[in-house]
């Protein structure tokens, strides 16, 4: 029942702490304005990592101070999270809301487990 969002099960962050994945949602066909929210689940707690509203014709834009960037194409959103550290390892859930025009739809992905491995410090050279 309702709209579903699909996202990969697992993603490994780069050594620079950057992780990217695609969040795809079932489109109702007439959504002009979409809101995408990235949530991080730790235990039973959900915290918002970043969010953006975009019009279907435009590219996705996150707030300047955001840890996320993204681009959109049709019913697919390519999300990139930056500045990840090992402590940032966790389940990242993509929430998509078709905000306008009515009707409102919401879809939640099952989550992408992002693994972040902090790079080993370079050994001192003599």
């Amino acid at each position: 029942k309702g709209m579903h969002a699909a996202q990969p099960a697992v993603v490994l962050a780069s050594s620079r702490g950057v992780a990217s994945f695609v969040c795809e949602y079932g489109s109702s066909g007439n959504a002009a304005e979409v809101r995408v929210t990235m949530l991080r689940q730790a235990g039973s707690q959900m915290t918002e990592v970043c969010a953006a509203t975009y019009t279907v014709e435009d590219e996705l834009a996150f707030l300047d101070d955001s840890t996320c960037t993204g681009t959109s194409s049709g019913n697919k959103v390519n999300l990139t999270i930056q500045g990840l550290r090992a402590m940032g390892t966790g389940l990242y859930i993509c929430k998509v809301e078709l905000m306008y025009p009515p009707p409102y739809y919401v879809g939640m992905g099952n989550g992408t487990q992002i693994y972040v491995i902090d790079p080993e410090p370079c050994p001192d050279s003599d």
Epitope: K1, G2, E33, T53, Y100, Y104, Y105
Partner: antibody, heavy 114, light 111 residues
Framework: EVQLVETGGDLMKPGGSLRLSCVAS????????MSWVRQAPEKGLQLVAG????????YYTDAVKGRFTISRDNAKNTLYLQMNSLRDEDTAVYYC???????WGQGTLVTVSS | QPVLTQPPSVSAALGQRVTISCTGT?????????VQWYQQFPGRPPKTIIY???NRPSGVPDRFSASTSGTTATLTISGLQAEDEANYYC???????????FGSGTQLTIL
């Protein structure tokens, strides 16, 4: 804390005009499409009008088309509802609502009676 | 006249579980459109307790849950508390009316 505060409700005569305002705070107003929902004792709840985040596109329920105009000023974090040619059946409490139904204002009462 | 049908009232004892039904048609609830549920106390605005069929906004206790089957949506409140005594409304989009439709509300009384 998200707050939506409606003002402008009044006792009006049929055929009159009224403008409701809703001042938003506690969230990025310009990122959200917004709606006006009314609640009348006999008619229950009804979504009256909606507007997209930029203000360029609007939606109206048939009962108010051509009489009501929804607009917004993102610089002032304010949503408006201009109500013209008021009818008895427009009597209701009018709520300002974020379009994903997450938050409602406290409402403002509009009474239309001769 | 509300398009979604709800029982006018339901009652249950403190700590018990209660369900409130919201019956529509193939053009609204049965058409796969998201269902919302609202709680309203006298003289107060509605508060959304379920959006998108089964999602709870933050701050809403997990005692509140919802499901949809066919043309009927159901709100379940378990472990009833005195503060749950209120009016409950459902809503959904109706494709034939191209408008949101609401239930007429159900008054929950805690015994």
């Amino acid at each position: 804390e998200v707050q939506l505060v409606e003002t402008g409700g009044d006792l009006m005569k049929p055929g009159g005009s009224l403008r409701l305002s809703c001042v938003a705070s506690g969230f990025t107003f310009s990122s959200y499409s917004m709606s006006w929902v009314r609640q009348a004792p006999e008619k229950g709840l009804q979504l009256v009008a909606g507007i997209n985040s930029g203000g360029s596109s609007t939606y109206y329920t048939d009962a108010v088309k051509g009489r009501f105009t929804i607009s917004r000023d993102n610089a002032k974090n304010t949503l408006y509802l201009q109500m013209n040619s008021l009818r008895d059946e427009d009597t209701a409490v009018y709520y300002c609502v974020i379009s994903n139904w997450s938050y409602w204002g406290q409402g403002t009462l509009v009474t239309v009676s001769s | 006249q509300p398009v979604l049908t709800q029982p006018p009232s339901v009652s249950a004892a403190l700590g018990q579980r209660v369900t409130i039904s919201c019956t529509g048609t193939a053009t609204n609830v049965g058409g796969g459109y998201d269902v919302q549920w609202y709680q309203q106390f006298p003289g107060r605005p509605p508060k959304t307790i379920i959006y998108g069929n089964y999602n709870r906004p933050s701050g809403v206790p997990d005692r509140f849950s919802a499901s949809t089957s066919g043309t009927t949506a159901t709100l379940t409140i378990s472990g009833l508390q005195a503060e749950d005594e209120a009016n409950y409304y459902c809503s959904s989009w109706d494709n034939s009316l191209t408008a949101y439709v609401f239930g007429s509300g159900t008054q929950l009384t805690i015994l």
